[in-house]
């Protein structure tokens, strides 16, 4: 058993049928010695008396808010949550496996640049009685500071019969140098509590591996005289790290016909312009990627050919 | 990217081309190592990230773009003195900081070159003959060093009398390649920045 926060405790249980559970001793936070009784949640049934209460915690029915009273007055509370260990592995019931980029990916994180700011998100099908708390650091043995905001509900989607809820959080490394070569990964830890179930999820990454630039901005077409060709031009996104000559991007320019079956013409360039043939009803799209470290491509920025 | 690429002008800066070749070569070598050594811990998540140049060179600090020198998190008090002549410096633009930066890069390359050559000698003794260093990568390191053209004492190749532990050697190769790839990215960024300025 360990303390999650004041008056909230997590009981770790080896979870299998007929398991013996864990013996827990609760102590009433009071100078009083006599006439103390204990109850669980809203029930008025007295579970025991005295300054301490010893309970055998086996199942969720044994978890909840234990309260000690004296003469009708509440003295203190202890909330017991359960953390299930199933065959040596902590349970992951609360969050959905996003399966990207690999199986058992519960937290996904992205950064728009090298400033040390990043966003993480996760999915769940649970809509109520759900709380999250996020902590982060650079490294784990001698951790350096990363400050995270509160997790917020960022999207709701319907997937088949189920509703899916996306939560996200923004974090900022306290003293980040965009040019630094990372040798210690960022660690992100999410505590999730659903009713009386506690779970924790972690992710470990280097900012360089989660970079995904915003799409190029100001995408424009300039027709070339007496030609089917057009000059496409664009700019680096505002959110990208500066100076751009140091934090350079490379670009992919795509000409896509109206039909998805039509052949796509693609050109790669390090410049912020390219000359392509603009077909009728086609559209031109451009996306960006760090020129020197191949992390994710940005989403496409698009303009119609006409 | 096996599709048409609009190639940029080589520019005035002779080292840019070499640094781009270096990054390409080390990235290919790392990819090859990860595939060949699939049963070894060779991925970024599995290895310890060690920097053999730590406390010996200060490339990131010495080569910091002017725009980032205002960022206190980027300024490290490490001071390292370097020789300051080199053919990549366009004489008019030669500045003390730029010379420090390029000599720091040269020292990095020299250190990695020695490590890689020592390691290759061990790998050649492996009866499994599972993996060797790409000669192209070693050649590209050499070319960039020549382009930088700094006078510096030659570091003798480390020789070891004890029987090599091939498992440890292969894991060390992965660690070195990951670190060298990160340094090659920094070198490429620096060359691109210097080329633009």
């Amino acid at each position: 058993i360990w303390e999650l926060k004041k008056d909230v405790y997590v009981v770790e249980l080896d979870w299998y049928p007929d398991a013996p559970g864990e013996m827990v001793v609760l102590t009433c936070d009071t100078p009083e010695e006599d006439g103390i009784t204990w109850t669980l949640d809203q029930s008025s049934e007295v579970l025991g008396s005295g300054k301490t209460l010893t309970i055998q915690v086996k199942e969720f029915g044994d978890a909840g808010q234990y309260t000690c009273h004296k003469g009708g007055e509440v003295l203190s509370h202890s909330l017991l949550l359960l953390h299930k260990k199933e065959d040596g592995i902590w349970s992951t019931d609360i969050l959905k496996d996003q399966k990207e980029p690999k199986n058992k990916t519960f937290l996904r994180c992205e950064a728009k640049n090298y400033s040390g700011r990043f966003t993480c998100w996760w999915l769940t099908t649970i809509s109520t009685d759900l709380t999250f708390s996020v902590k982060s650091s650079r490294g784990s043995s001698d951790p350096q500071g990363v400050t995270c905001g509160a997790a917020t509900l960022s999207a709701e989607r319907v997937r088949g019969d189920n509703k899916e809820y996306e939560y996200s959080v923004e974090c900022q490394e306290d003293s980040a140098c965009p040019a630094a070569e990372e040798s210690l990964p960022i660690e992100v830890m999410v505590d999730a509590v659903h009713k009386l179930k506690y779970e924790n999820y972690t992710s470990s990454f280097f900012i360089r591996d989660i970079i995904k630039p915003d799409p190029p901005k100001n995408l424009q077409l300039k027709p070339l005289k007496n030609s089917r060709q057009v000059e496409v031009s664009w700019e680096y996104p505002d959110t990208w790290s500066t100076p751009h000559s140091y934090f350079s991007l490379t670009f992919c320019v795509q000409v896509q016909g109206k039909s998805k079956r039509e052949k796509k013409d693609r050109v790669f360039t390090d410049k912020t312009s390219a000359t392509v043939i603009c077909r009728k009803n086609a559209s031109i799209s451009v996306r960006a990627q760090d020129r020197y470290y191949s992390s994710s491509w940005s989403e496409w920025a698009s303009v119609p050919c006409s | 990217r096996n599709l048409p690429v609009a190639t940029p002008d080589p520019g005035m800066f002779p080292c840019l081309h070499h640094s781009q070749n270096l990054l390409r070569a080390v990235s290919n070598m790392l990819q090859k190592a990860r595939q060949t050594l699939e049963f070894y811990p060779c991925t970024s998540e599995e290895i310890d990230h060690e920097d053999i140049t730590k406390d010996k060179t200060s490339t990131v600090e010495a080569c910091l773009p002017l725009e980032l020198t205002k960022n206190e998190s980027c300024l490290n008090s490490r001071e390292t003195s370097f020789i300051t002549n080199g053919s990549c410096l366009a004489s008019r633009k030669t500045s003390f900081m730029m010379a420090l930066c390029l000599s720091s890069i040269y020292e990095d390359l020299k250190m990695y070159q020695v490590e890689f050559k020592t390691m290759n000698a061990k790998l050649l003794m492996d009866p499994k003959r599972q993996i060797f260093l790409d000669q192209n990568m070693l050649a590209v390191i050499d070319e960039l060093m020549q382009a930088l053209n700094f006078n510096s004492e030659t570091v003798p190749q480390k020789s070891s009398l004890e029987e090599p532990d091939f498992y440890k050697t292969k894991i060390k190769l992965c660690i070195l390649l990951h670190a060298f790839r990160i340094r090659a990215v920094t070198i490429d960024r620096v060359m691109s920045y210097l080329n633009a300025s």
């Epitope: 080896d14 299998y16 260990k85 065959d87 592995i89 019931d93 199986n103 | -």
Partner: antibody
């Protein structure tokens, strides 16, 4: 004490269907994940499928994906394995099993796929 | 499709020490725990060892388990006639959990 009693096995022709049941007692069935494991005659153990305590997630071995469906009825304390498009290579003793560091197995039920 | 490799058979005379190996990889035994089962002819498997080296109550202390790197082993010190059975190791792959990975199985023969 914990008990898992299996039923539903038998002889079936290739391409036909069969449903196995596993009735649980002696524990809170709705709190625990459950597996199906099979063993072909004279061969080793092969995992078939898993279902979460609440039925929300199901996992299958590649060899049965798209043909077998694991399900549970927590109100009846029963685990099921619906097997469709049966093949000769599905011939085996099928076991249900609880998920956890200490596990309990059903007695097994024989499924024979033969024409 | 078996990723955990066991020797097909091992044998010993009563009182001898018998060991069974189970060889896996970094993503299964290397990053998780191992169980061992005993299966007597015509019966369901019985748990002998969980969590690499833990014995459930009721399992004789002549059975012991260990794990090192990407391999595990089961030792029977002072093997007895009633230990003649098939033995299976089991683990999980970190990418496909909760799918169970079973070893190929080992037939233990106790020589008269």
């Amino acid at each position: 004490q914990v008990q898992l009693v299996q039923s539903g096995g038998g002889v079936v022709q290739p391409g036909r269907s069969l449903r196995l049941s596993c009735a649980a007692s002696g524990f809170t069935f709705s709190s625990y994940g459950m597996h199906w494991v099979r063993q072909a005659p004279g061969k080793g153990l092969e995992w078939v499928a898993f279902i979460r305590y609440d039925g929300s997630n199901k996992y299958y071995a590649d060899s049965v994906k798209g043909r077998f469906t694991i399900s549970r009825d927590n109100s009846k304390n029963t685990l099921y394995l619906q097997m469709k498009s049966l093949r000769a290579e599905d011939t085996a003793v099928y076991y249900c099993k609880t998920h956890g560091s200490h596990d309990n197995w059903g007695q097994g039920t024989m499924v024979t796929v033969s024409s | 499709s078996y990723v955990l490799t066991q020797p097909p058979s091992v044998s010993g005379t009563p009182g001898q020490r018998v060991t069974i190996s189970c060889s896996g990889g970094r993503s299964n035994i290397g990053s998780g725990t191992v169980k061992w089962y005993q299966q007597l002819p015509g019966t369901a498997p019985k748990l002998l060892i969980y969590g690499n080296d833990q014995r459930p109550s009721g399992v004789p202390d002549r059975f012991s388990g260990s794990k090192s790197g990407t391999s595990a082993s089961l030792a029977i010190t002072g093997v007895q006639a009633e230990d003649e059975a098939d033995y299976y190791c089991q683990s999980y792959d970190r990418g496909t959990h909760p799918a169970l990975l079973f070893g190929t199985g080992t037939k233990v023969t106790v020589l008269g």
